[in-house]
């Protein structure tokens, strides 16, 4: 069966300066390949987090991505600013040269409230 990417929340609201968790779970780890978070869609989308060795300030994984039984690819964004507003997508890729996008979550819109 094809892997499904589940983003349970359609939207979240967070006060500027606070932290928020964007939830994403997969139904399978197969096929082999990375999971990445983007803000926006199309050519202009911005890479927010990749479950690899890359380092992303203010963004951390919520659960242990190296754990073999782990299907939770949620992220935490800390010290949220108004510029963080937008729709975030959890995207599953199949490993290759280059990697191929095979499934995306439905997106979670982040609203940033003035503190």
């Amino acid at each position: 069966t094809e892997v499904k990417v589940i983003q349970p929340e359609k939207s979240v609201s967070v006060a500027a300066g606070d932290s928020t968790v964007l939830n994403c779970t997969l139904t399978s780890l197969l096929p082999v390949g990375p999971i990445r978070w983007y803000r926006g869609v199309g050519q202009s989308r911005q890479l927010i987090y990749s479950f690899t060795t890359e380092h992303f300030p203010r963004v951390t994984n919520v659960s242990d991505a190296t754990k073999r039984s782990n299907l939770d690819f949620s992220i935490r964004i800390s010290n949220v600013t108004p510029e963080d507003a937008g729709t975030y997508y959890c995207v599953k890729f199949q490993r290759g040269s280059p990697d191929t996008e095979i499934q995306s979550g439905g997106g979670t819109e982040v609203y940033v409230l003035a503190k």
């Epitope: 780890l29 242990d64 190296t66 754990k67 073999r68 039984s69 782990n70």
Partner: antibody, heavy 124, light 106 residues
Framework: AVTLDESGGGLQTPGGALSLVCKGS????????MNWVRQAPGKGLEWVAG????????YYGAAVQGRATISRDNGQSTVRLQLNNLRAEDTATYYC?????????????????WGHGTEVIVSS | ALTQPASVSANPGETVEITCSGG?????YGWFQQKSPGSAPLTVI????KRPSDIPSRFSGSKSDSTGTLTITRVQAEDEAVYYC??????????FGAGTTLTVLG
């Protein structure tokens, strides 16, 4: 060569606490998940606890859940197991193990190296 | 716990297979040799089929469906030991098999 040296075993009192330390060398300690495994006299192997390479995530076996704390200091290349409220059934040889570049704490399929072990006897 | 046979036996030079089942759906199997009670185990296979550098090529591992297999070709007397498989269950907890005693006959 990879070496894992455990210390802190010995005779312990029921209800007391113990602290085991494992010192790793010969590999990039901060890149590998670590586990503690024990073996009671005449019994098989039992997983005790595990910790991810960065120390953010910890995992515990059912027999020690709520009594154990695993932690690591990547600067010192050490992993520590604290076990409280000791019972006679905690009597065992405790082994420190290293994961070989895959998996995390609890993923025993990834263990590629073992320490020599430290013996713990819980008795009054 | 993982399921593995209690004992297997083989003559020197023969091939022996030890199976292990019960690991989580996403997990692999590792194989650990213990030559005597109280002596430190030795990893002979990890991550299904990877072999530490000091382990002879006579030891190999594989996984088919949810069953892991340790294969020892050209068995030698020094291979006599208890072999444990290890993995993790679907909750992520580490699990071992009860151990398989390999007896080398003759």
């Amino acid at each position: 060569a990879v070496t894992l040296d455990e210390s802190g075993g010995g005779l312990q009192t029921p209800g007391g606490a113990l602290s085991l330390v494992c010192k790793g060398s010969g590999f990039t300690f901060s890149s590998h998940a670590m586990n503690w495994v024990r073996q009671a006299p005449g019994k098989g192997l039992e997983w005790v606890a595990g910790i991810s390479s960065d120390g953010r995530f910890t995992y515990y076996g059912a027999a020690v859940q709520g009594r154990a704390t695993i932690s690591r200091d990547n600067g010192q290349s050490t992993v520590r197991l604290q076990l409280n409220n000791l019972r006679a059934e905690d009597t065992a040889t405790y082994y420190c193990t290293k994961n070989g570049g895959c998996g995390s704490g609890g993923d025993l399929d990834c263990i590629d190296a073992w320490g020599h072990g430290t013996e713990v006897i819980v008795s009054s | 716990a993982l399921t593995q046979p209690a004992s297997v036996s083989a003559n020197p030079g023969e091939t022996v297979e030890i199976t292990c089942s019960g690991g989580g759906s996403n997990n692999a199997y590792g194989w650990f040799q213990q030559k005597s009670p109280g002596s430190a185990p030795l990893t002979v296979i990890y991550d299904n089929g990877k072999r530490p550098s000091d382990i002879p090529s006579r030891f190999s591992g594989s996984k088919s469906d949810s069953t892991g297999t340790l294969t020892i070709t050209r068995v030698q007397a020094e291979d006599e030991a208890v072999y444990y498989c290890g993995s993790a269950d679907n909750s992520g907890a580490g699990v071992f098999g009860a151990g398989t005693t390999l007896t080398v006959l003759g």
